[in-house]
């Protein structure tokens, strides 16, 4: 009906467009307008023409879209109970939220060794600066010339922590650190998109009670059972893509003071102190080329001490003390932004339901009839291909019977046919441990539904 309406509307517009616009030169009013207001008329006619052309185009497009929709409807295989071809894949989902913070990068490589500067005059020794932090251990530098031993500076207080370096070459393996305290459990990640049904994972023991399912057949009322165990995990899914590193968590409270750590490599030397007031000037020698540093000469007699120099800048960091005992764990940092969700892994098999619900049942009488299994929220049947007494024994034991016998032609079930080619040895404690097709994969009809007769 919509198509016919659109076609009629299209014809009317075309007629109107042709008669009222293109043939307008022949009409008296058009001529009158033309003679009375030639410029104004042309402008109005042109804009009206554009509007009508746009309307006509829109109607044509709508018409084509409707025809396509009708084709989709009339050619839809589902209309005639024929399975259609699979549609093209949907567009890629939005990127998930940012991932948890990545692990910190390793220390960067050591800076290149600077060129040796010309020797400055000795200033009077300033007071020792505060101790700098232990530097990240760099690679061994080239051996420098032997310097005269300096006097040991007073231990400085630790300097501020340096910025994180770019990744360095692997250093020598350090001593094994103390075991850290266990981190708190992270928040649940965003769910991935639903994956294809995977191969059945091995069912585990009973899971905790799930959300209430749809109403089942009335059973004989029993007292509530104890909570069951969760099902065993299904096969592991493909790993998700790595999330974008989240921002660092807030700094935890500092741990208690540790025992002294093992000695770190010396940090870089601090800048020289400001020179003190010079002592009495010695005779100036003529400047030779700078030679290799000679051995230290005998100590000259002390000059008259000059006044104390201005306090020197911070001295080289002292050697790190021995390693401290591990501090108490800081408080957990704020959670990083969630990473984008990984691709969905192959779905594992659903575990046993919790409580005292069972995952197998007999439809018929309490111990003889059609064998059914519960999977993915639905009861379904078992195809009798390869179905034999060893399979029936396992099935019956799951219901607390001692013995089982395979039955055939026990009456057709409805709905899902869950299992086919079940091949148990008879010692398995659960049907899920037997060799069998993947859930829902079969070449059977309900005429071939398997049955059991269980006994004590």
């Amino acid at each position: 009906v919509q198509v016919l309406n659109l076609q009629a509307r299209l014809r009317v517009l075309e007629m109107y467009f042709l008669n009222d616009t293109l043939a307008a030169e022949d009409s008296p009013s058009f001529s009158l307008l033309q003679s009375a207001h030639p410029g104004e008329h042309l402008a109005q006619g042109a804009s009206r023409l554009q509007v009508l052309q746009a309307q006509l185009t829109w109607v044509r497009v709508s018409h084509e879209h409707l025809l396509q929709r009708v084709d989709n409807f009339t050619q839809n295989p589902g209309m005639f109970r024929i399975k259609g071809e699979q549609g093209a894949p949907g567009l890629q989902g939005h990127k998930g939220a940012m991932g948890m913070p990545g692990a910190p990068g390793p220390p960067g490589p050591p800076a290149e060794k600077g060129a040796k500067g010309a020797m400055g005059r000795d200033g009077a020794t300033g007071p020792s600066g505060p101790q700098g932090p232990p530097g990240v251990k760099g690679e061994a530098g080239l051996q420098g010339p032997q310097g005269a031993p300096g006097k040991q500076g007073a231990t400085g207080t630790p300097g501020p922590q340096g910025e994180k370096g770019s990744k360095g070459d692997g250093g020598l393996i350090g001593p094994k650190g103390e075991t850290g305290t266990k981190g708190e459990k992270g928040d649940l990640g965003l769910p991935g998109s639903k994956g294809d049904r995977g191969m059945k994972g091995d069912a585990g023991v009973m899971g905790p009670p799930g959300a209430q399912g749809s109403k089942g057949d009335f059973g004989r009322p029993g007292p509530p059972g104890l909570a069951g165990f969760p099902g065993a995990k299904g096969d592991q899914g493909q790993p998700g893509l790595q999330g974008v590193p989240g921002p660092p968590g807030a700094v935890g409270h500092p741990g208690a003071k540790g025992e002294p750590g093992s000695a770190g490599s010396p940090g870089r030397a601090g800048l020289p102190g400001s020179p003190g007031s010079p002592g009495a000037t010695g005779l100036k020698g003529s400047k030779g080329d700078t030679g290799l540093q000679g051995q230290q000469g005998r100590k000259g007699e002390s000059g008259v001490p000059g006044p104390a120099g201005v306090k020197g800048e911070q001295g080289s960091p002292g050697l790190a003390g021995p390693k401290g005992a591990p501090g108490q764990a800081g408080q957990k940092g704020d959670q990083g932004v969630k990473g984008s969700s990984g691709e969905q892994g192959v779905k594992g098999e659903k575990g046993e339901r919790g409580e005292n619900s069972v995952s197998v049942r007999i439809v018929g009488s309490s111990n003889r009839g059609r064998a059914e299994v519960y999977y993915s929220g639905t009861w379904g049947t078992i195809c009798d291909d390869e179905w034999q007494n060893s399979d029936a024994i396992v099935f019956c034991r799951m219901l607390g019977y001692s013995k089982g016998r395979a039955l055939y032609k026990v009456g057709a079930g409805t709905g899902q046919i869950w299992l086919d080619n079940v091949q148990c040895r008879g010692t398995e404690s659960t049907l899920w441990s037997c060799t069998k097709n993947s859930w829902g994969h079969h070449d059977c009809s309900h005429e071939e539904d398997a049955g059991v007769e269980c006994s004590v």
Partner: antibody, heavy 119, light 107 residues
Framework: QGQMQQSGAELVKPGASVKLSCKTS????????ISWLKQKPGQSLEWIAW????????TYNQKFRGRAQLTVDTSSSTAYMQFSSLTTDDSAIYYC????????????WGQGTSVTVSS | DIVMTQSQKFMSASVGDRVSVTCRAS??????VGWYQQKPGQSPKVLIY???FRYSGVPDRFTGSGSGTDFTLTITNVQSEDLAEYFC?????????FGGGTKLEIK
């Protein structure tokens, strides 16, 4: 919280029989499996059999079939194991334990009954 | 019958240590494995079921892992009250079978 109370120690002669009891409370007896296990001093555990109180069905370890006989009394929520043709090798502690399904671990255990077979 | 092998009969640890008790099945038992702790003169207690699920009330320093044929019980931050014997058990097939046990001694 479930509990399982076993009968007291037994001293029996070779060739005799002994009947051990296991009284349960704190869970629905009829919808649970009761297993019996044997542990010789300083050794590991051996599973003898289970009985499902809801049906009376029993699954045995073939090693003990014919000598261990399991029964239940649902009115008193008690399980029994009668062990016959005893030899000195049967001297051990015997435990009862419950599991919710045959394919689940044993989560409640009795305190054990010591059986000594000696002439 | 499926044989469960615990290769270490004894293990020694100091308080605060981390220890791993291993168990190997003679054939695939999927994840149908439990771990039990038995203190001297007491009944066994279940710690882990389905290979990696901690039973309710069990301290989180006990963790289980593995599937197929190789399984591990790990105790981190060992405490003096962990002095006990540890058994693995498969309940995938009848008869159920147990490992020979691993005794943990505290130094």
């Amino acid at each position: 919280q479930g509990q399982m109370q076993q009968s007291g120690a037994e001293l029996v002669k070779p060739g005799a029989s002994v009947k051990l009891s296991c009284k349960t409370s704190g869970f629905t007896f009829s919808s649970n499996y009761i297993s019996w296990l044997k542990q010789k001093p300083g050794q590991s555990l051996e599973w003898i059999a289970w009985i499902y109180a809801g049906t009376g069905g029993i699954t045995y370890n073939q090693k003990f079939r014919g000598r261990a006989q399991l029964t239940v009394d649902t009115s008193s929520s008690t399980a029994y194991m009668q062990f016959s043709s005893l030899t000195t090798d049967d001297s051990a502690i015997y435990y009862c334990a419950r599991h919710v399904r045959g394919y689940h671990p044993m989560d409640y255990w009795g305190q054990g009954t010591s059986v000594t077979v000696s002439s | 019958d499926i044989v469960m092998t615990q290769s270490q009969k004894f293990m020694s640890a100091s308080v605060g240590d981390r220890v791993s008790v291993t168990c190997r099945a003679s054939q695939n038992v999927v994840t149908n494995v439990g771990w039990y702790q038995q203190k001297p003169g007491q009944s066994p207690k279940v710690l882990i079921y389905s290979a990696s699920f901690r039973y309710s009330g069990v301290p989180d320093r006990f963790t289980g892992s593995g599937s197929g044929t190789d399984f591990t019980l790990t105790i981190t931050n060992v405490q003096s009250e962990d002095l006990a014997e540890y058994f693995c058990q498969q309940y995938n097939n009848y008869p159920y079978t147990f490992g020979g046990g691993t005794k943990l001694e505290i130094k």
